[in-house]
C-alpha cells in the first residue's frame, strides 16, 4: 500500500490550524509518529519538532482499507514570530519508513496580515489578521 503525508491549513477566527495528515493502512498505525517542524532543513525529528503525535492501532476500525491520521497544531494568533518554514514529517519505528511533506511557509506582512504558501494550489491562504477573515 501507499503511505503518504500531506500538509494543509485552515482558519477559524484568529486561529490558524496547521494540519499534517498521514494516509496509511490500519495495521501500519502502530509505531508511527507524525510531527511538525519549523525552520529545520535537515534535522526534522520528533525530538526537534514543535508537536508530535504517536499513532495507535484503532481496533474499532474494520477492514484493511487506507485510513488517515491527523496531527493538528493550532496557533491562536499568528504573530511575526511565527514567520518561517514548516514541514510535516512522519516515521515508523517498526518499518523504518520516513515521510517528509512539502515545505510550506507562514509570512507575516508589514500590514499585519499573514499568508500561508507552499500548500497545494487550492490551499494557498491569505489571512487578514485584524478581521480574522479569509481574504
Amino acid at each position: 500500500g501507499c503511505i503518504n503525508i500531506t500538509s494543509s491549513a485552515s482558519q477559524e477566527g484568529t486561529r490558524l490550524n496547521l494540519i499534517c495528515t498521514v494516509w496509511h493502512k490500519k495495521e501500519e498505525a502502530e509505531g508511527f509518529v507524525v510531527f511538525l517542524c519549523k525552520d529545520r532543513s535537515g534535522d526534522c525529528s520528533p525530538e526537534t519538532s514543535l508537536k508530535q503525535l504517536r499513532l495507535k492501532r484503532d481496533p474499532g476500525i474494520d477492514g484493511v482499507g487506507e485510513i488517515s491520521s491527523q496531527l493538528m497544531f493550532t496557533i491562536s494568533q499568528v504573530t511575526p514570530l511565527h514567520s518561517g518554514t514548516y514541514q510535516c514529517c512522519a516515521r515508523s519505528q517498526k518499518s523504518g519508513i520516513r515521510l517528509q511533506g512539502h515545505f510550506f511557509s507562514i509570512l507575516f506582512t508589514e500590514t499585519g496580515n499573514y499568508t500561508v504558501t507552499g500548500l497545494k494550489q487550492r490551499q494557498h491562504l491569505e489571512f487578514s489578521h485584524n478581521e480574522g477573515t479569509l481574504s
Epitope: T14, K38, L50, S76, Q77, P80, L81, G112, G132
Partner: antibody, heavy 119, light 107 residues
Framework: EVKLVESGGGLVQPGRSLKLSCAAS????????MAWVRQAPTKGLEWVAS????????YYRDSVKGRFTISRDNAKNTQYLQMDSLRSEDTATYYC????????????WGQGAMVTVSS | EIVLTQSPTTMTASPGEKVTITCRAS?????MHWYQQKPGASPKPWIY???KLASGVPDRFSGSGSGTSYSLTINNMEAEDAATYYC??????????FGAGTKLEIK
C-alpha cells in the same frame, strides 16, 4: 524542567552599556521565540524585545529601539540583551521569558536580573 | 498602541469572598492573558486566552470577556490568592502590552 537563568545585571552610569545573558535549559531552545520583559521598582510589567526562534527577526518597544539589541546563540541555548546609552528610566528587573508557540502568552520566566542606572 | 486599564488598582477581600478584577482595552483585542505575581517572585501565567487556566491554577479562578472588556474572577478568596494580577494582550504593530496591575490583599 524549564529553567531560565539571567546574569549580567548591576549598577551602571547613565550613557554606559551593559549586557544581560539568559541561559536556557529543559526545552528545545532553538524552537522557541524568546523575549525580555522588565519591571521598574514597585511598577508594572513592560515588554522590551522579542527574537524569532532562528534569531533573524527582532522586535523592540519604541523607547529602546536603537539602544537595545536582542540576540541569541542557539548552539549555546542562550539569549542576550545588549543595552547601550542607558538611561535612569531603564532601571528595572529584566526577566528572560519564553514565548508560548501556540498562544501569545509568556509562559516561562527567569528569576530576573536587576539593572540600576544611576550616577 | 493599545492601552490596558485595570481596575481596581488595589483591593482588599475577605476569605471566602468573590473577587472580580477587570481589564479594559482601548481598542478591541482577541484574547487576554493574566499573570499572578507575589512579592519578590517572578510573574506566573495564570489565565491564558481569556478563560483557560494555566497548569496548577485552582479552579476557583476563572476568566471571561471579549472585545474591550475582560475580567478575572476568584470565587472563594483564599489567603494564598493575595498577589498582584496583570493583564496582557498582543496586537500588531505595538506587540505586547500589560495592564498596570491590581494588588489584591487579604483582610
Amino acid at each position: 524542567e524549564v529553567k531560565l537563568v539571567e546574569s549580567g545585571g548591576g549598577l551602571v552610569q547613565p550613557g554606559r552599556s551593559l549586557k544581560l545573558s539568559c541561559a536556557a535549559s529543559g526545552f528545545t531552545f532553538s524552537n522557541y521565540a524568546m523575549a525580555w520583559v522588565r519591571q521598574a521598582p514597585t511598577k508594572g510589567l513592560e515588554w522590551v524585545a522579542s527574537i524569532h526562534s532562528g534569531g533573524g527577526n527582532t522586535y523592540y518597544r519604541d523607547s529602546v529601539k536603537g539602544r537595545f539589541t536582542i540576540s541569541r546563540d542557539n548552539a549555546k541555548n542562550t539569549q542576550y540583551l545588549q543595552m547601550d546609552s542607558l538611561r535612569s528610566e531603564d532601571t528595572a528587573t529584566y526577566y528572560c521569558v519564553t514565548h508560548n508557540y501556540e498562544s501569545t502568552v509568556f509562559d516561562y520566566w527567569g528569576q530576573g536580573a536587576m539593572v540600576t542606572v544611576s550616577s | 498602541e493599545i492601552v490596558l486599564t485595570q481596575s481596581p488598582t488595589t483591593m482588599t477581600a475577605s476569605p471566602g469572598e468573590k473577587v472580580t478584577i477587570t481589564c479594559r482595552a482601548s481598542s478591541s483585542v482577541s484574547y487576554m492573558h493574566w499573570y499572578q505575581q507575589k512579592p519578590g517572585a517572578s510573574p506566573k501565567p495564570w489565565i491564558y486566552e481569556t478563560s483557560k487556566l494555566a497548569s496548577g491554577v485552582p479552579d476557583r479562578f476563572s476568566g471571561s470577556g471579549s472585545g474591550t472588556s475582560y475580567s478575572l474572577t476568584i470565587n472563594n478568596m483564599e489567603a494564598e490568592d493575595a498577589a498582584t494580577y496583570y493583564c496582557q494582550q498582543w496586537n500588531y504593530p505595538s506587540m505586547y502590552t500589560f495592564g498596570a496591575g491590581t494588588k489584591l490583599e487579604i483582610k
